[in-house]
């Protein structure tokens, strides 16, 4: 008799997901020298061990720390790009200039970046079939929960001038419910940070506007202010020519604005 | 390859002001980040203040912050410091330096790839 299963609002565990969180610490452990000393089998007993068993509606932070523990990473503190809505051109961005990071290019952003995962209260299975969707389900997931984790502490380790890449093609160029909005930017240490840079990418090829006067990048302003830290904001108005002019920035072409 | 010259530098008295120019020979210096350092004989180069090369964000050492003030006027391809309330400690060679990498902006005189000859600022009590 098949046994009864909570039926989600989310897609399931990412196929293969044991394998690919496997091999993806074996790749980045051989590429970064700084972490050949990570087990990475015992990275994964400590992934599984977050949410394995455990009711997918009833994961915490706490549940997290072996692997937090595990995946201790130093990057440096001023080199960190925050993203919001506009993961692909900040991670073009730092393919280019190998001395920024942003989350995805530490360890623990690297395993679990794009994946989805979840198990079942009591049972040693991993969900295949359905995951909670933050919305229609629960936040407290194990997906939502381990980004909240890694994002708090990425944007804790943050100092001197952080930047931020901004989608200026959505109708929220800054959203409160980002990951960026709801936890990145409360968790920037004022001690430690003096500026918050933002990049507001523009979308359109013939779009001129400042988009830095956005009311929704004035709310940033005003929470960033608040908080003591100095805000600054840049339209790139051709994020090709931006990519292109980081990669070559002695081009001639890299005079007039980017 | 980008040239800068530092000018601006000179002999004042404590609680003085002095306004220190960096400019650079590269019209694609605009977005480069800058930053300012002050070299004492026998010491390192010490980091005084930076800016971003596309939002002009602002960094400063601690013993920077509230008196000195750095900017930057692209159109003429140059870099400020402006000193206010000036004291004998602030004495040095004060090198401009230039960091072609686009985004961030760092303390650290090893990343910056170009650097001024210097200008020297004496404050005396």
């Known amino acids: 008799v098949p046994r009864w299963r909570q039926q989600w609002s989310g897609p399931g565990t990412t196929k293969r997901f044991p394998e690919t969180v496997l091999a993806r610490c074996v790749k980045y452990t051989e590429i970064h020298p700084e972490m050949r000393h990570v087990d990475c089998q015992s990275v994964w007993d400590a992934f599984k061990g977050a949410f394995i068993s455990k009711h997918p509606c009833n994961i915490t932070e706490e549940d997290y720390q072996p692997l937090m523990k595990l995946g201790t990473q130093t990057v440096p503190c001023n080199k960190i790009l925050l993203w919001s809505r506009i993961k692909d051109l900040a991670h073009q961005f730092t393919q280019v200039q190998r001395d920024m990071f942003t989350l995805e290019d530490t360890l623990l952003g690297y395993l679990a970046d794009d994946l989805t995962w979840c198990g079942e209260f009591n049972t040693s299975k991993i969900n295949y079939q359905s995951c909670p969707d933050w919305r229609k389900d629960c936040s407290n997931n194990p997906v939502s929960v381990f980004w909240k984790t890694v994002s708090r502490r990425f944007a804790e380790a943050a100092c001197d001038v952080v930047h931020v890449m901004l989608n200026g093609s959505r109708s929220k160029i800054f959203d409160k419910n980002s990951t960026f909005g709801s936890v990145e930017v409360h968790n920037l240490q004022p001690e430690k940070v003096q500026t918050l840079e933002a990049w507001v990418i523009h979308g359109g090829r013939e779009d001129s506007r400042d988009l830095c006067q956005d009311p929704t990048i004035k709310e940033l302003e005003s929470i960033i202010s608040k908080r003591n830290i100095q805000f600054s904001c840049k339209n790139i108005y051709r994020p090709d020519k931006f990519l292109q002019c980081v990669k070559n920035p002695e081009d001639s072409s890299c005079t007039s604005e980017i | 390859e980008v040239q800068l010259e530092e000018s601006g530098g000179g002999l004042v008295q404590a609680g003085g002001s002095l306004r220190l120019s960096c400019a650079a020979s590269e019209r694609t210096f605009g977005n480069y980040p800058m930053g300012w350092f002050r070299q004492v004989p026998g010491k390192e180069r010490e980091f005084v203040a930076a800016i971003t090369g596309l939002a002009g964000s602002r960094l400063y050492a601690d013993s920077a912050k509230g008196r000195f003030t750095i900017s930057r006027d692209n159109a003429k391809n140059t870099v400020y410091l402006q000193m206010n309330n000036l004291q004998p400690e602030d004495t040095g060679v004060y090198y401009c330096?230039?960091?072609?990498?686009?985004?961030?902006?760092?303390?650290?005189?090893?990343?910056?790839?170009?650097w001024g000859q210097g200008t020297q600022v004496t404050v005396s009590s």
């Open positions: 330096a230039a960091d072609r990498r686009i985004g961030g902006v760092t303390r650290e005189s090893r990343e910056y790839e170009y």
